[in-house]
């Protein structure tokens, strides 16, 4: 009696369980009473990355420069090629098809979490004590001096951009 | 220890100005913030700004931007806010707080015991 | 500016109950440098002026019972009361001071029945 299913890494055709190919290859011919599946091997820049009856490998990822891509992991013929983002930008998509730079944090904000190939810059409010005074993308806001230290008094207070201002001790007000 | 006395209530017609002070004693009073808070019946604590004596930096909140001024005096330890241009709105307690360091930032730890202002014609 | 939201607004409870009140931000009083929230509980007793309590969230002042516990981070904090005393028959409320200008919450008006 024919069978109506097949074990694993097989399939079912004309009534007969045949073979899948593995993976980094692709389907030639289905088995039959005589013979085995016959597979190939994908050619060059193309991959299959599971037990298949493909007749056609796919093609490996193109890391387009033109969209700020380069290639993180080169493709086989069992695994696809990963795209990464250059460096100062990160991926739009989890699948990475293009890229765009890095977000920078204002004055008055600091970066929480530096930017990866994947995810943006995270900026936060520079709170009361601290300051960032420039636009970046790794700087995190910086401690407002404390004077005493440096055997100087404040002149003038810090602001979430700028930091304190020292001065002698002798200064005439 | 730690104290912050403040003057006494005040009667005020409107479009008068008041002078409210804050003696501070029992610390550096130049480094520490001075905080100036309004409380009026019903509407809670409400922040008006401060100021720095040792350098006379202030930050004003903008809801009060031409209302309050202030000014502070290091050698008699006293900070001073000035309500300008008075209407029955700026009847209130107003109390005076030590804030935070100047370089570090923080809570109101000590507070005045509070000055009435009334505003009536 | 930062909003301030506290509940209830008030709350009568009998002496040697557990009260707890909710204080949230409009933005995150965490800052990641310092893994500190500047948040504070202040306790304002009729006729009086307000009393530090809790600051950087958590931390109790010196000389302030330890039936007082402040909790939370980001944007959500409470302030719980143990064991509630007739003494503490208050007005309180949450400050943050991350940035300018410093808020307070509106307040929670603790009755004692």
């Known amino acids: 009696e024919p069978p109506t299913a097949c074990r694993e890494k097989q399939y079912l055709i004309n009534s007969q369980c045949c073979s899948l190919c593995q993976p980094g290859q692709k389907l030639v011919s289905d088995c039959t009473e005589f013979t085995e599946t016959e597979c190939l091997p994908c050619g060059e820049s193309e991959f299959l990355d599971t037990w298949n009856r493909e007749t056609h490998c796919h093609q490996h990822k193109y890391c387009d420069p033109n969209l700020g891509l380069r290639v993180q992991q080169k493709g086989t013929s069992e695994t696809d090629t990963i795209c990464t983002c250059e460096e100062g930008w990160h991926c739009t998509s989890e699948a990475c098809e293009s890229c765009v730079l890095h977000r920078s944090c204002s004055p008055g904000f600091g970066v929480k979490q530096i930017a990866t190939g994947v995810s943006d810059t995270i900026c936060e409010p520079c709170p009361v004590g601290f300051f960032s005074n420039v636009s970046s993308a790794f700087e995190k806001c910086h401690p407002w001096t404390s004077c005493e230290t440096k055997d100087l008094v404040v002149q003038q207070a810090g602001t979430n951009k700028t930091d304190v201002v020292c001065g002698p001790q002798d200064r005439l007000r | 220890q730690v104290q912050l006395q403040q003057s006494g209530a005040e009667l005020m017609k409107p479009g008068a100005s008041v002078k409210i002070s804050c003696k501070a004693t029992?610390?550096?009073?130049?480094?520490?913030?001075i905080e100036w808070v309004k409380q009026r019946p019903g509407h809670g604590l409400e922040w008006i700004g401060e100021?720095?004596?040792?350098?006379?930096?202030?930050n004003y909140n903008e809801n009060f931007k031409g209302k309050a001024t202030f000014t502070a005096d290091t050698s008699s330890n006293t900070a001073y806010m000035q309500l300008s241009s008075l209407t029955s709105e700026d009847s209130a307690v107003y109390f005076c707080?030590?804030?935070?360091?100047?370089?570090?930032?923080?809570?109101?730890?000590?507070w005045g015991q509070g000055t009435s202002v009334t505003v009536s014609s | 500016d930062i909003v301030m939201s506290q509940s209830p607004s008030s709350l009568a409870v009998s002496v040697g109950e557990k009260v707890t009140m909710s204080c949230k931000s409009s933005?995150?009083?965490?800052?990641?440098?310092?893994?500190?929230?500047?948040l504070a509980w202040y306790q304002q007793k009729p006729g009086q002026s307000p009393k530090l309590l809790i600051y950087?969230?958590?931390i109790r002042e010196s000389g302030v019972p330890d039936r007082f516990t402040g909790s939370g981070s980001g944007t959500d904090f409470t302030l719980t009361i143990s064991s509630v005393k007739a003494e503490d028959l208050a007005v309180y409320y949450c400050?943050?001071?991350?940035?300018?200008?410093?808020?307070f919450g509106g307040g929670t008006k603790v009755e004692i029945k």
């Open positions: 100021i720095l004596p040792g350098s006379g930096s202030t």
């Open positions: 707080a030590r804030g935070g360091l100047y370089y570090y930032g923080g809570a109101m730890d000590y």
């Open positions: 400050q943050q001071y991350y940035s300018y200008p410093y808020t």
């Open positions: 950087w969230a958590s």
């Open positions: 029992g610390y550096t009073f130049s480094t520490y913030w």
């Open positions: 933005q995150s009083l965490l800052y990641s440098g310092n893994q500190k929230n500047y």
